[in-house]
Amino acid sequence: FQTFEGDLKWHHHNITYWIQNYSEDLPRAVIDDAFARAFALWSAVTPLTFTRVYSRDADIVIQFGVAEHGDGYPFDGKDGLLAHAFPPGPGIQGDAHFDDDELWSLGKGVVVPTRFGNADGAACHFPFIFEGRSYSACTTDGRSDGLPWCSTTANYDTDDRFGFCPSERLYTQDGNADGKPCQFPFIFQGQSYSACTTDGRSDGYRWCATTANYDRDKLFGFCPTRADSTVMGGNSAGELCVFPFTFLGKEYSTCTSEGRGDGRLWCATTSNFDSDKKWGFCPDQGYSLFLVAAHEFGHALGLDHSSVPEALMYPMYRFTEGPPLHKDDVNGIRHLYGPRPEPEPRPPTTTTPQPTAPPTVCPTGPPTVHPSERPTAGPTGPPSAGPTGPPTAGPSTATTVPLSPVDDACNVNIFDAIAEIGNQLYLFKDGKYWRFSEGRGSRPQGPFLIADKWPALPRKLDSVFEERLSKKLFFFSGRQVWVYTGASVLGPRRLDKLGLGADVAQVTGALRSGRGKMLLFSGRRLWRFDVKAQMVDPRSASEVDRMFPGVPLDTHDVFQYREKAYFCQDRFYWRVSSRSELNQVDQVGYVTYDILQCPED
């Protein structure tokens, strides 16, 4: 285990927390419960108690946010960074923030609470078996009333437990119609609508009339969201799967991986994919809010990342249903706060919120159906998480940013550095690297930890290159360079030792330029570098666009691969080939799809 510098900790044992806002991915009661259970893990092994309060005077403020959310450490969209937390202290210190661009679940797919049926409000179980078929979303199969339902256990055929999924045919929210269900079709501004609509609103909320004529009655409600069938990616992000849909002449009542080589589940967002070509990916397993929160609260209590892979405080997301705390976590937290006074409590139990009473007219009986085909099984989990580096330390304390789930190089948006070493391409990101060898069907191998192979290096690298003759590896990060020859390292040395002035903040890339010579890049400038002397020729300074016309001026990485130069900006590269002393851009592409041959979404 590791603690923050100075063993930062709370100096009182009755810790308070405030849930400042919520994610729409989970019912509020489930979020409340996940956080309470996560705190209970730590109170079970220490003298700490955790009390929920309703003001920002709390020790730990919990917030869901996206991108720049007011603390100077922006989130990065889906996947990547999942959450971050600050070590104990006043104000923002101790607070835990969760990236709301993630799909938050309990680690096993979207959480869809049910109503009525016979399962007492239990959540859907995805995937579930019904009449021998596997379903990864709510379905209307077996019903003539169009109400979506799901099984609340893995197998409806054997267990017979079911409930109804959120549906505008069951109820609406807010509005002015007391939660009555939608009336389809309904008239709005003289037009007939047979589904929820966003027409007439600028905020994107779906609504419907609860009588046949909105223009006359002005009664409406908002349509419940259907987390189980709201698609991501594809060309219809945010829209709902339409079941059944037709694909290649065949009808599908659930998400399918047909037509894809990568096994990912998808659905059409109209009833006919063949004619409309509208589709998106079905929700994945999501990230367990309970497990991520337990990790974050560890930081908020004073624990930094652990180097023990099985520990909760290890900086990688890994879904587990076993007890999350490892001995290392317990040792760490007890180092700060001591053990819990005897007796040890029983592990916390979870409660499922009770469903509200059914309306007077409620949907009838369980479904009966005779399906004609069996789709593929439910979705598999996302790639497990890889570590991300901490942001630079603040004036008084360091903060930690844990848990990024990009173990698959194909999920990395932007690599820190790329280099050809030996005859393989090495891709570096946040303390990890992957190796890639070109070839039909080959995939990047990894991730491997940089610290295991090159222990002297920082987690964040700006550029890397190998000098072929001496086999020396140059690693640049900020104003420093490390030179590895085999396992021995020279450095870190400051860039000015290479003859680069104080105005050069980083080296963003390198290309070979004749025997024992390289070109070093920094932003818009480049220099000729003598590898043996380990010095740049200051007179060789030049502008990148003079030597390489057509490449972007704000590249973050330049590397050589298969004798061609690659200039990276964002997720893209500009490839330059040299013919008779002329440098010409001959290709622009995606690093992941076009170099690493990743499957396209």
């Epitope: 202290g89 923002i92 994107g204 603040g394 304390t397």
Partner: antibody, heavy 116, light 108 residues
Framework: EVQLVQSGAEVKKPGASVKVSCKAS????????ISWVRQAPGQGLEWMGW????????NYAQKLQGRVTMTTDTSTSTAYMELRSLRSDDTAVYYC?????????WGQGTTVTVSS | QAVLTQPPSASGTPGQRVTISCSGS????????VNWYQQLPGTAPKLLIY???HRPSGVPDRFSGSNSWNTASLAISGLQSEDEADYYC?????????FGGGTKVTVL
């Protein structure tokens, strides 16, 4: 007592720069952000930007990008806002505010007049 | 840049209830949290409500806030003469802070 005390009024010519200071006391300066908000005469509040005293990261209003710089000096618990290339429509009262789930503590305001 | 829309003015007699609305034009105010500020004439603004409905200590309980779907509201029940002031709503929108145009509350 938690308070923010701002520097005094300034009169500047168009094209000049102004630097307003905001000294914090009564709380741990580095555990909170500071927002800067201005109010032109008879007008509403306009957010200019924000700086984290924890890590010095900044976030500026798009409209002022390139003209405004916010900094902090943690040794004196002071935040600074510099606005360059002043124009007559920059005439306003400039406020600093501690920002933590709402701007809960405000400075008294600094009047900046831009006039030729 | 998103805009938060407030009515320019509202009024009531002492003891009455006054409600000020704040709606988002290009983003869902309902999925953001909203803060409200009171600015008495000639003074700096004061935080009145944070995170939709929470009152900082010292703010009388006649001030209350709510936020659902695309409208946030500030209610003043039992209006008093000292409540005569400008009221501003504020929210975050894609990395920027946005203020409403302000509502002048007059006690008749």
């Amino acid at each position: 007592e938690v308070q923010l005390v701002q520097s005094g009024a300034e009169v500047k010519k168009p094209g000049a720069s102004v630097k307003v200071s905001c000294k914090a006391s009564g709380y741990t300066f580095t555990s909170y952000g500071i927002s800067w908000v201005r109010q032109a005469p008879g007008q509403g509040l306009e957010w200019m930007g924000w700086i984290s005293a924890y890590n010095a990261n900044t976030n500026y209003a798009q409209k002022l990008q390139g003209r405004v710089t916010m900094t902090t000096d943690t040794s004196t618990s002071t935040a600074y806002m510099e606005l360059r290339s002043l124009r007559s429509d920059d005439t306003a009262v400039y406020y600093c505010a501690r920002d933590y789930y709402g701007m809960d503590v405000w400075g008294q305001g600094t009047t900046v007049t831009v006039s030729s | 840049q998103a805009v938060l829309t407030q009515p320019p003015s509202a009024s009531g007699t002492p003891g009455q209830r006054v409600t000020i609305s704040c709606s988002g034009s290009t983003f869902n105010i309902g999925s953001n949290t909203v803060n409200w500020y009171q600015q008495l004439p000639g003074t700096a603004p004061k935080l009145l409500i944070y995170s939709d409905s929470h009152r900082p200590s010292g703010v009388p309980d006649r001030f209350s806030g709510s936020n659902s779907w695309n409208t946030a509201s500030l209610a003043i029940s039992g209006l008093q003469s000292e409540d005569e002031a400008d009221y501003y709503c504020q929210a975050w929108d894609s990395s920027a802070v946005v203020f409403g145009g302000g509502t002048k509350v007059t006690v008749l």
